[in-house]
Interface confidence: low
């Protein structure tokens, strides 16, 4: 289709090479068409279409995204050619940063309901640049935490080094919806609830003598409880002896509960003690079996192909640790009689 009639928007993504971050493009189709797409004949020349991202209508979730190759080749369907770009309703998610994401992205409705819809499309020219050392060194993270029940704030990473007075007007979106009252480089939250969690996007306009463009940053916000003050506790095994049959296979499970920590590096491992020797055992990877806001239960098994006499002389020890401390639980195998 002819993209010459598409409305055009220029965006800049400046990414930090030190952290993982995502980026999004919204299919900014004009406001009056959010249910019927772009029947441009409904607008008089004096009416300026208000560009907004995804409006939540069922229709608008059905859009098609393309990338325009720089060499003039035909448009490419995003879903077929770019595995690191995911389409969610009318939003395009870039999972990994990199200058190779630079280019022109076009969105338009999948369903063309009238001849006027043919020209209904938005072309976004995205420029992606790594943050230079000259940029602010202590810019806000693209992953920010809000402590439940307390006050907090969400900062726009690309503007966090500027004072509120210097800051340009910022447009904020949460999960693709416009937050019309927020205009500064920081959203202040008086009391944090779990619904404050989500994907926030902050946009502001930058201009030079030639053109203007939108600088965009994406912030993943999670609501968290305070870090635990407790070391992990072992839920299983409870008993320190276990009756077993010689020659039979055996699996011993270690389940431990870890309290929430913002920087979470749980350790759960098995080791064997035998007389004056002690060594860690290669066992299957640990797996999380339950995760809540406050804690996580992690399980790791030790598997014996068959129980031998030698195993009865040993202690099998489950060791768990977080930043507060560690806990152990040892199990001695005992031959089942009769």
């Amino acid at each position: 289709f002819n993209i010459s009639g598409c409305s055009t928007k220029k965006l800049l993504w400046t990414y930090s090479t030190r952290s993982e971050e995502e980026f999004v493009l919204f299919c900014d189709l004009p406001e009056p068409q959010k249910s019927h797409f772009c029947h441009r004949n409904r607008l008089s020349p004096k009416q300026v279409p208000e560009h907004l991202p995804f409006m939540g209508s069922n229709d608008l979730s059905d859009v098609q995204w393309y990338q325009q190759p720089s060499n003039g080749d035909p448009l490419e369907d995003i879903r077929k050619s770019y595995p690191h770009i995911i389409q969610d309703k009318c939003t395009l998610h870039f999972l990994t940063p990199g200058v190779n994401n630079s280019g022109s992205y076009i969105c338009r409705p999948k369903m063309i309901k009238s001849p006027y819809d043919v020209a209904c499309c938005v072309k976004m020219i995205l420029e992606v640049k790594p943050q230079t050392n000259a940029s602010c060194e202590y810019s806000a993270s693209h992953k920010q935490d809000l402590l439940l029940g307390s006050t907090g704030s969400i900062s726009c990473p690309s503007l966090s080094c500027q004072s509120d007075a210097q800051s340009p007007a910022v447009t904020w979106y949460k999960n693709g919806k416009l937050l019309s009252v927020e205009r500064s480089n920081r959203i202040v939250v008086d009391e944090v609830y779990d619904y404050h969690q989500g994907t926030y996007v902050c946009d502001y306009t930058q201009s030079d003598t030639v053109s203007s463009w939108t600088v965009r940053a994406v912030v993943q916000v999670r609501t968290i409880v305070g870090d635990t003050k407790l070391k992990p506790d072992i839920l299983d095994p409870v008993e320190d002896t276990l009756e077993v049959e010689l020659g039979k296979p055996l699996t011993i499970s270690c389940k431990a509960r870890f309290g929430f920590e913002r920087v979470f590096n749980p350790v759960i491992k098995w080791y064997i003690k035998d007389s004056d020797l002690e060594w860690e055992v290669s066992v299957p990877e640990a797996k999380s079996i339950k995760s809540t806001l406050k804690d996580e239960i992690i399980e790791r098994n030790i598997i014996l192909e068959k129980v031998t006499q030698r195993d009865l002389r040993r202690k099998f020890v489950c060791f768990v640790q977080n930043s507060i401390g560690n806990t152990t639980q040892s199990v001695q195998l005992k031959e089942k009689r009769g």
């Epitope: 010689l246 020659g247 064997i272 035998d274 007389s275 004056d276 020797l277 002690e278 060594w279 055992v281 290669s282 030790i302 598997i303 014996l304 192909e305 068959k306 031998t308 006499q309 030698r310 195993d311 002389r313």
Partner: antibody, heavy 119, light 114 residues
Framework: SLEESGGDLVKPGASLTLTCTAS?????????VCWVRQAPGKGLEWIAC???????TDYARWAKGRFTISKTSSTTVTLQMTGLTAADTATYFC??????????????WGPGTLVTVSS | DIVMTQTPASVEAAVGGTVTIKCQAS??????LAWYQQKPGQPPKLLIY???TLASGVPSRFKGSGSGTEFTLTISDLECADAATYYC????????????????FGGGTEVVVK
């Protein structure tokens, strides 16, 4: 004493079973029986051990899957070898360790049997 | 698996002299270490087990020491009959679950007696 048998000249890819036979004692729960090999002009290389009491086995990582140690009677232990290559050419020794002491330190060794893998 | 590193590869000493051979384990093996002597055309002979215990019939000129990862075999008052290759062996009786490496040998040290 211990004596190994079954060494032979075989082609690459072949299988071979070596036997270790005890004389003057039997392989009871008191002993570990181990196989060790030595390529011509090279050092000793541990292959595997078996607890003669409960039959539990222990292999060098490189030997797992291709070599199988078994106790076949109260006086014999075998080493089955599959997928032989020229790198398996060596003298194969069987040795006896002390299970009560719970180590593989071997106080009794056989004279060895030569396995040659060549096309 | 445990890796045993033995040094030196070769050592020369005079009759009546002393030779020291070192063996290093890639992880702690407590005192589960044996030393063997091997002469050409013969199977190895056990000298020392549990790092420092002399095997039956072995003269006290052979002395083993160390624990954990560092071990030493010292042969004093060298005799011509001591010319041989010496091997250390990690020999904890492990099982399939332990991944402890069983009976790995060091690369050997040739002792030449002048």
């Amino acid at each position: 004493s211990l004596e190994e048998s079954g060494g032979d000249l075989v082609k690459p890819g072949a299988s071979l079973t070596l036997t270790c036979t005890a004389s003057g004692f039997s392989f009871s729960s008191r002993y570990y029986v181990c196989w060790v090999r030595q390529a011509p002009g090279k050092g000793l290389e541990w292959i595997a051990c078996i607890d003669a009491g409960d039959g539990s086995t222990d292999y060098a990582r490189w030997a797992k899957g291709r070599f199988t140690i078994s106790k076949t009677s109260s006086t014999t232990v075998t080493l089955q070898m599959t997928g032989l290559t020229a790198a398996d050419t060596a003298t194969y020794f069987c040795a006896r360790g002390d299970a009560y002491r719970d180590d593989y330190a071997s106080d009794l060794w056989g004279p060895g049997t030569l396995v040659t893998v060549s096309s | 698996d445990i890796v045993m590193t033995q040094t030196p590869a070769s050592v020369e000493a005079a009759v009546g002299g002393t030779v020291t051979i070192k063996c290093q384990a890639s992880q702690s093996i407590s005192s589960y270490l044996a030393w063997y002597q091997q002469k050409p055309g013969q199977p190895p002979k056990l000298l020392i087990y549990r790092a420092s215990t002399l095997a039956s019939g072995v003269p006290s000129r052979f002395k083993g020491s160390g624990s954990g990862t560092e071990f030493t075999l010292t042969i004093s008052d060298l005799e011509c009959a001591d010319a041989a290759t010496y091997y250390c062996q990690s020999n904890y009786g492990s099982s399939s679950i332990s991944n402890y490496g069983g009976g790995a040998f060091g690369g050997g040290t040739e002792v030449v007696v002048k």
